[in-house]
Interface confidence: medium
């Protein structure tokens, strides 16, 4: 029956949840009501084989390999561990046990398309005119922001921030072509009076 020592399901009157021979209407924690009596739930990692009777304990069996149950339960079938499909960009982050599911995450450079991580997509690149505000993680995409006046980005990148326009003045040059959100300013020599 694989019970924890501290959770024995002794079949005494107290355990039946009623008094004076009356059938119980509610059961204690980690028990369930069936056929007017309280039976022990199966512990995490085990499934129900048969309900208890007046004379027998609840019968539970451990989940098989690649299966799990993560709660005290009366399930007759264990859940299959999640499959981290590499074709969907997934890899195993944490191997499942009889009590926990497998946790999938994305390959490097990818992120989950939902918190449940059922598939992955490549990190988004920020288009020219936009810079990276926040670099992507395994669970969140790149966050882009428009380059403000005085800044530009001329590449599509998942890492590059907006760069400030070149300061022509510090090079003793003047602006020959104004900058945009996608292009730097073009500096040139000052026209000298002849």
């Amino acid at each position: 029956d694989y019970k924890d020592d501290d959770d024995k399901d002794y079949k005494d009157d107290d355990d039946k949840g009623g008094s004076g021979g009356e059938p119980p209407t509610a059961c204690r924690e980690k028990q369930y009501l069936i056929n007017s009596q309280c039976c022990s739930l199966c512990q995490p990692g085990q499934k129900l084989v048969s309900d208890c009777t007046e004379f027998t304990e609840t019968e539970c069996l451990p989940c098989g390999e690649s299966e799990f149950l993560d709660t005290w339960n009366r399930e007759t079938h264990c859940h299959q561990h999640k499959y981290c499909d590499p074709n969907l960009g997934l890899r195993v982050q944490q191997k499942g046990t009889s009590e926990t599911d497998t946790i999938c995450t994305c390959e490097e450079g990818w992120h989950c398309t939902s918190e449940a991580c059922e598939s992955c997509v490549l990190h988004r690149s920020c288009s020219p005119g936009f810079g990276v505000k926040q670099i992507a993680t395994g669970v969140s995409d790149t966050i882009c922001e428009p380059c403000p006046v005085g800044f530009f980005s001329n590449v599509s990148s998942a890492f590059e921030k907006c760069h400030p326009w070149t300061s022509c003045e510090t090079k003793d040059l003047v602006v020959q072509q104004a900058g945009t959100n996608k292009t730097d300013v073009v500096c040139g020599p000052q026209d000298r009076l002849r």
């Epitope: 993560d70 709660t71 399930e75 859940h79 299959q80 999640k82 499909d85 590499p86 074709n87 969907l88 960009g89 398309t113 939902s114 918190e115 449940a116 059922e118 598939s119 992955c120 997509v121 490549l122 988004r124 995409d141």
Partner: antibody, heavy 117, light 106 residues
Framework: EVQLQQSGPELVKPGASMKISCKAS????????MNWVKQSHGKNLEWIGL????????TYNQKFKGKATLTVDKSSSTAYMELLSLTSEDSAVYYC??????????WGQGTSVTVSS | QIVLTQSPAIMSSSPGEKVTMTCSAS?????IHWYQQKSGTSPKRWIY???KLASGVPARFSGSGSGTSYSLTINSVEAEDAATYYC?????????FGGGTKLEIK
């Protein structure tokens, strides 16, 4: 603005096959996983499968294996679903839906398929 | 497969009332997503990852829940909220939808 534009309604004969297209605009199709969903009688929604639009990897609902085939053409930003050996049970509206932030974020307008002789 | 049971199937409400619809999963799921569908149109993402409102969704909507029990609440219902609302899970393939709750406004 992100949009998924699906191909028009289809009237097909039993036993025939057909292909529905779903063209993405306003974003790169590879930025989303593409799902396909069937809606029968304007009510029940059923998930058919999904395709990773970058790798082409697919996952199907067991019920639709052999019935639906999902593909993607990255160059045209278009996802496709081919429906095989059609019967009257396949008459429904089919949607493509892109997943990017935890749910089916963007939906196509739907393609109505009627199977009738 | 995980079965999602929505209740009630149909509900009627008057403007200004508080409305709650539920989605019960046959086994535990991590997140539930909600979609709104109006007659003749595509479903729209409405609430994702149990409680996050999609862009453009009014603040009168909220989502909550965990394990096998989830709900969508509208604090003060308005005429434009008349629609069918579907819940959906990503926990186990096949990724399933509930049967929908049709909200009618009197």
């Amino acid at each position: 603005e992100v949009q998924l534009q699906q191909s028009g309604p289809e009237l097909v004969k039993p036993g025939a096959s057909m292909k529905i297209s779903c063209k993405a605009s306003g974003y790169s199709i590879t930025g989303y996983t593409m799902n396909w969903v069937k809606q029968s009688h304007g009510k029940n929604l059923e998930w058919i499968g999904l395709i990773n639009t970058y790798t082409g990897g697919t996952t199907y609902n067991q019920k639709f294996k052999g019935k639906a085939t999902l593909t993607v053409d990255k160059s045209s930003s278009t996802a496709y679903m081919e429906l095989l050996s059609l019967t009257s049970e396949d008459s429904a509206v089919y949607y493509c839906a892109g997943t990017g932030t935890g749910a089916m974020d963007y939906w196509g307008q739907g393609t109505s398929v009627t199977v009738s002789s | 497969q995980i079965v999602l049971t929505q209740s009630p199937a149909i509900m009627s409400s008057s403007p200004g009332e508080k409305v709650t619809m539920t989605c019960s999963a046959s086994s535990s799921v991590s997140y539930i997503h909600w979609y709104q569908q109006k007659s003749g149109t595509s479903p729209k993402r409405w609430i994702y990852d149990t409680s996050k409102l999609a862009s453009g969704v009014p603040a009168r909507f909220s989502g909550s829940g965990s394990g096998t029990s989830y709900s969508l609440t509208i604090n003060s219902v308005e005429a434009e909220d008349a629609a069918t609302y579907y819940c959906q899970q990503w926990r186990t393939n096949p990724y399933t939808f509930g049967g929908g709750t049709k909200l009618e406004i009197k």
